[in-house]
Structure formats: structure tokens, C-alpha cells
Interface confidence: medium
Amino acid sequence: SGVFQLQLQEFINERGVLASGRPCEPGCRTFFRVCLKHFQAVVSPGPCTFGTVSTPVLGTNSFAVRDDSSGGGRNPLQLPFNFTWPGTFSLIIEAWHAPGDDLRPEALPPDALISKIAIQGSLAVGQNWLLDEQTSTLTRLRYSYRVICSDNYYGDNCSRLCKKRNDHFGHYVCQPDGNLSCLPGWTGEYCQQPICLSGCHEQNGYCSKPAECLCRPGWQGRLCNECIPHNGCRHGTCSTPWQCTCDEGWGGLFCDQDLNYCTHHSPCKNGATCSNSGQRSYTCTCRPGYTGVDCELELSECDSNPCRNGGSCKDQEDGYHCLCPPGYYGLHCEHSTLSCADSPCFNGGSCRERNQGANYACECPPNFTGSNCEKKVDRCTSNPCANGGQCLNRGPSRMCRCRPGFTGTYCELHVSDCARNPCAHGGTCHDLENGLMCTCPAGFSGRRCEVRTSIDACASSPCFNRATCYTDLSTDTFVCNCPYGFVGSRCEFPVGLPPSFPW
């Protein structure tokens, strides 16, 4: 919205004649009609699309036009418009002779036109007047014009509306280009958003007036950056509201169950190292010479048959000792003092001289082995027992001693941990390679679904306006964490708007 202003300054018609050349009687009582319209390369017929204005009679023949009111007319003439100023225009100014007092077009004789000027071009919005002078054969008109914006309109095209205000619709003043300039403490497109206390957490805090920091549910502290843990949380912390993340050595919903089984029960024997691996769960790392879950079984080092050439093995506290048969020596009886002449090969083995008779080698028949064919073939050498089973020679046959959870001739079958229905409260059991896992029904948790938990109060989506829902497990209730601009137990109310201020 703006105004095209036209200031008529001087009109010269020395001979007092009309455009037709006929003289006015007694002189040309002159008034003006102005037509403002959209740009045309040649100003041509059609409506005055940007507006029209007429003056009263301003003078006779030649005269200067005063700057203020002249006989009831205004100078400058005002042509208001209520659209975006396009930056271009066409202007027609006609000077007419009024023989009487009626200035309407139909009341004038057809040849009452004194002169007509038509100009067109570009015109930017601004305070400066453009001075122009148009001369015809008999007349001269001096005038100036400009386009200015109406009150509260700004910008290059007078298209930006801006009214300063300080109320709940906004807190701003207007810049010369029509952009808003927020008052201190306010921000946002329309300066409706208060600037909270410096450092107030962006998501977890909010404010309804400048320099305030109000915490959303689940948060606390001056800057609303500390979460509130679950009610009843004993040995735990939180990173989001209502959490209870247990400290080292504690477990359970409220972190009140001791997980440090090693310290409190010392289950590992024979100097083994104990490691906690969950609630009532541990792992023993055995010292050499011991085995078993709790390292309670002593390992015989002779079990691996370390003595060769028929040597017998004796367990000792710090290891084992080989007693060698005649003709052999060494830690494992691996060195021989015999030759083929001593017939060292047993069980039908044939002797072959080596190193010019200084040594020998026995070629054993099937089912026998050893450097002197003294051993029956150990059926356990091929490790036939699966899943960590222990192979035992039993005369002509062999057998596998299976680890817990496995069965079958070669320990190849997995004993189902689920067979004994370990999952409580209707939990579903799943066999895993190293144990089992229970999938619990709603309202139960724990490794065996033994812990009764709350029903999820958030399941019914009770929070409004895209709030985040948290379940308070101690009370079977929910808490809504509201987004910016909403409050209430379900975030159902907009934040109270700041009070209005008189400008």
C-alpha cells in the first residue's frame, strides 16, 4: 500500500487557447485530470488502473500552483494504491478549460481540452521528488512526482506490512525495510518466543518470559540438565528421566540386588580367579592342574601319557616323572641305548638299522604304535568326542565322557536346557548354544521371568501434542515429557501466554 504523489508547480498557456487552437472566452479557466495506470510502451486507452484524480480550477491561462490546498484541492495530488508497487507506471495529465462550475466530463464542450501529456517509465519508491517539464506547441507544464509507502508499509514495493507491538502477538519494532526487530529478550519470526535463561537446556527446559528456565517433567536443576531417576532407584543413575542404570555390582529394577557373587560367596576353589558375569553368575579361571566349574577337580598330568618307549608315569606335586624301561633314558624316555641286535621291537614289529647301526627304527604292525611298537593304537588320538567331550580308552574300545548339556556316543547331541521348563509365569524357552533364554509375557522380567514388573502405562498413548511418555514402574503410572509450548499432566494445555503490555 502506498501513494503516488503529483505536485503541479506551474502551467503556462500564454495565448489562452484550447488544443483545437480556439481561444478561451474570456480566458482558460484551467483544471487538471490525472490518470495513473500500469506501464504501457505507448500510453494508450483503457481504464486508469492505478487511479484517477481531478483538481478544481487552479488558475486562468498561466499560473503557478501553491504547495498546499488551492481552492479546496490538494497539492501534491494523492493517488493511493493498495497493491505492490510494480516499479513502472504510465501517467496522463490533461489540462481542461471549465467554462462554468460543472467540471464533470459530460458537462464540458467536446473541445474543452487545453493540453494532454502522457509519460511512462520506471519509478522506485522513495522520498525524492522527480522534477519534469512537458512542453507542447502552446503550453508548458512543470510538475514533480514520487511514490511513498503508506503508514506501516515498507520495502521496495510498499508490500511489507509492519506495525510495532509489544503484546502476546509479538514484541518488536519495524526496521526501514519492513523487517521486524525483536525487543530485548524475544526471538522468533514474529518475536513471540521468549529467550530463556542463558544455558537453559533446549529440549528439557522452557520459559514463558525472558530469562526464565522451567523444567519439563523428569528434569531438574537450574538449567534443567539433570535427569530425575526412577522413584526407588537405590544404587543407580539416569541419562534420561525415570531410568535406573545400576552402579557396578548392582542389579534389579531398582538396582538393589547384589551382583558381586564372587566377593560374597567365594565359589572358586584351589586358588582360582573369580569373575562376576551377571546376577548370581560367575566364571572361575583355574590354576594349572585343576579343572571343573569351580576348579574343584585336580588334573593328573599323567593323563596325557607323556612317557614314551614303555616308560611308566608317576604324578608329583609339581608335575610328573617318567620311569624308563631298560635301554631308554630322557625326560620322556625318548632316548634309546639299544640296537636291532637287542630285538627292541615288540608285538611283531620289524627292526631297521639307522646311522650305521648306532640307532634303529621299528616298523609296527597295525593296531600298534610307539617307538618300540609297545603301545596299542590310541583310539582317542583323532579327538572323536564333540562339544569338548573327554575321550577314554576302554580296552579294545573307546568312550566319550560328555560335558554337561551334551549326550550321545560322541557327545554330539545337545541336551535341551528347556526340557525342565525353567521359564516361570508362562515364559517361552529358547535353547541357545551355551544355555537358554526366556521370552517373558507382559508384566514379567528376569532371566527366568521370575520378576513381576508393572504393566506399561504408556501403551495407551496417553500423552498429547507429540509428548514423550515414560512409565513409572513403581506406581504403574505414566509421566508425559511435554514439547515446547505445552504443559499439563498429559501436555494438553498450551503454555500460558505472557501478559499483554501497553505499548
Epitope: 500500469h38 505507448v42 483503457g46 481504464p47 488502473t49 494504491f81 497493491f83 473541445d111 502522457a118
Partner: antibody
């Protein structure tokens, strides 16, 4: 008046005498019509003769002028081409303040450009 | 230049309504003014102004002629059609220079 048959490249001048209205108050125009191209605006002149405007295809070849004392409009056509063949009408071209919705058209002048 | 498109012919019955349309290649509306005119041309005669600024009846034109439209789509309606309305009708825009005319719609008896 002034129409007829003319050879390509030659000249012709059309005249239009106005009556029944104050000729000197009105901008005037020439419009032509041929069966192929239909109605086509050609040129305009301001009420006092100081401003003129032409369609691109006749610019530099045609000249519009007026004699307000004789209430007559002219169109000087030089370097004529076969595509200038048409019926040429003169008409008033104003309406800012004068009773809008009234128009004065000439009866038309036939111009044929052919060898 | 603004191009105006009209259908070449329209067959009508005397006493019935005739609707002639004109479509502009760009809007011819400015400041709430719809800068479109309608002309009637009988064979061998000069064009005659019927409607100006899309909907205003020109001086001396009977009220059975009416115009409507804005932006790019305009309509001339004759209701009822009479025998001496059989002619060619042209639309013409005055939004931009050069002024341009439509190709004309010939009104024919059914």
C-alpha cells in the same frame, strides 16, 4: 482513402478523415485485417502527434502521422511486401476520460500488394 | 506478445444461448481490471465494440450480450441469439502492447 493495387517494394499513402468527435483530443491507430492473419494492430499516434508506436513487422517502413487542423490521419507505407496485403482500418485509440465504450472505426481501405 | 485463442466456429439455434470463449497465454488482469474487449464483425463491415473491460456493455449494445471472466479465461454470451447476430466475434486484450486480437469465432446457424 488511398488504397488499391501496388507492386512489392513500392509506396502507398492512406488517409482517414474524422468527423463527429473532437479529433485533436484522441490518440488514433491503424488496424489491418487479412484472411490469414486476422485482425492486427499496426501503428498508434498520440493526440498531439508527438509520440508514435509501430508493430515490429512494419517498423522503419510505415509512418503514421496526423493533421489536427484537418482532422485527418495518415499512414505512409513504403517498401511494401505481399504480406502487407489487407484491409486497413483507422480507429480512435483513447478512453481514459472520454466516454469509454464508444469507438469510431473507419469503413476500411483495401490494399493489395502484388506484382 | 499475448496470444489469444478462440475456437474457429460455433453452431447455434436461433432463440438459444451462445457461449464464445477466449483464452489468453498470460493473465490480462491488473488491479482488478480485466482488460479484455469483444468485437462483432459482420461480413464486409468494420468491427464493432460490444464489451469492454471483460464485462461492461459498450454504448448502444443490446443487453442480450454479456461478458465475463478474469485472468486468462473469458466468455462472451449471447442470450437469446437473433438472426442479425450471425457474424464473427473477436476478443482483444489491452493489458500489454502490442494490442492483440483472437483469431475470431464464426457464429453459424445450426
Amino acid at each position: 482513402s488511398g488504397g488499391g493495387l501496388v507492386q512489392p517494394g513500392r509506396s502507398m499513402k492512406l488517409s482517414c478523415a474524422a468527423s463527429g468527435f473532437t479529433f485533436s483530443n484522441y490518440d488514433m491507430a491503424w488496424v489491418r485485417q487479412d484472411p490469414k492473419k486476422g485482425l492486427e494492430w499496426v501503428a498508434t499516434i498520440s493526440y498531439d502527434g508527438r509520440s508514435t508506436y509501430y508493430r515490429d513487422s512494419v517498423k522503419g517502413r510505415f509512418t503514421i502521422s496526423r493533421d489536427n487542423a484537418k482532422s485527418t490521419l495518415y499512414l505512409q507505407m513504403d517498401s511494401l511486401r505481399s504480406e502487407d496485403t489487407a484491409t486497413y482500418y483507422c480507429k480512435d485509440y483513447d478512453g481514459h476520460y472520454h466516454p469509454y465504450g464508444m469507438e469510431a472505426w473507419g469503413q476500411g481501405i483495401s490494399v493489395t500488394v502484388s506484382s | 506478445d499475448i496470444v489469444l485463442t478462440q475456437s474457429p466456429a460455433l453452431a447455434v439455434t436461433l432463440g438459444q444461448r451462445a457461449t464464445i470463449s477466449c483464452r489468453a497465454s498470460q493473465s490480462v488482469t491488473i488491479s482488478n481490471y480485466n482488460l479484455m474487449q469483444w468485437y462483432q464483425q459482420r461480413p464486409g463491415r468494420q468491427p464493432k465494440l460490444l464489451i469492454y473491460d471483460a464485462s461492461n456493455l459498450a454504448s448502444g449494445i443490446p443487453a442480450r450480450f454479456s461478458g465475463s471472466g478474469s485472468g486468462t479465461d473469458f466468455t462472451l454470451t449471447i442470450d437469446p441469439v437473433q438472426a442479425d447476430d450471425i457474424a464473427t466475434y473477436y476478443c482483444q486484450q489491452s493489458r500489454d502492447d502490442p494490442r492483440t486480437f483472437g483469431g475470431g469465432t464464426k457464429l453459424e446457424l445450426r
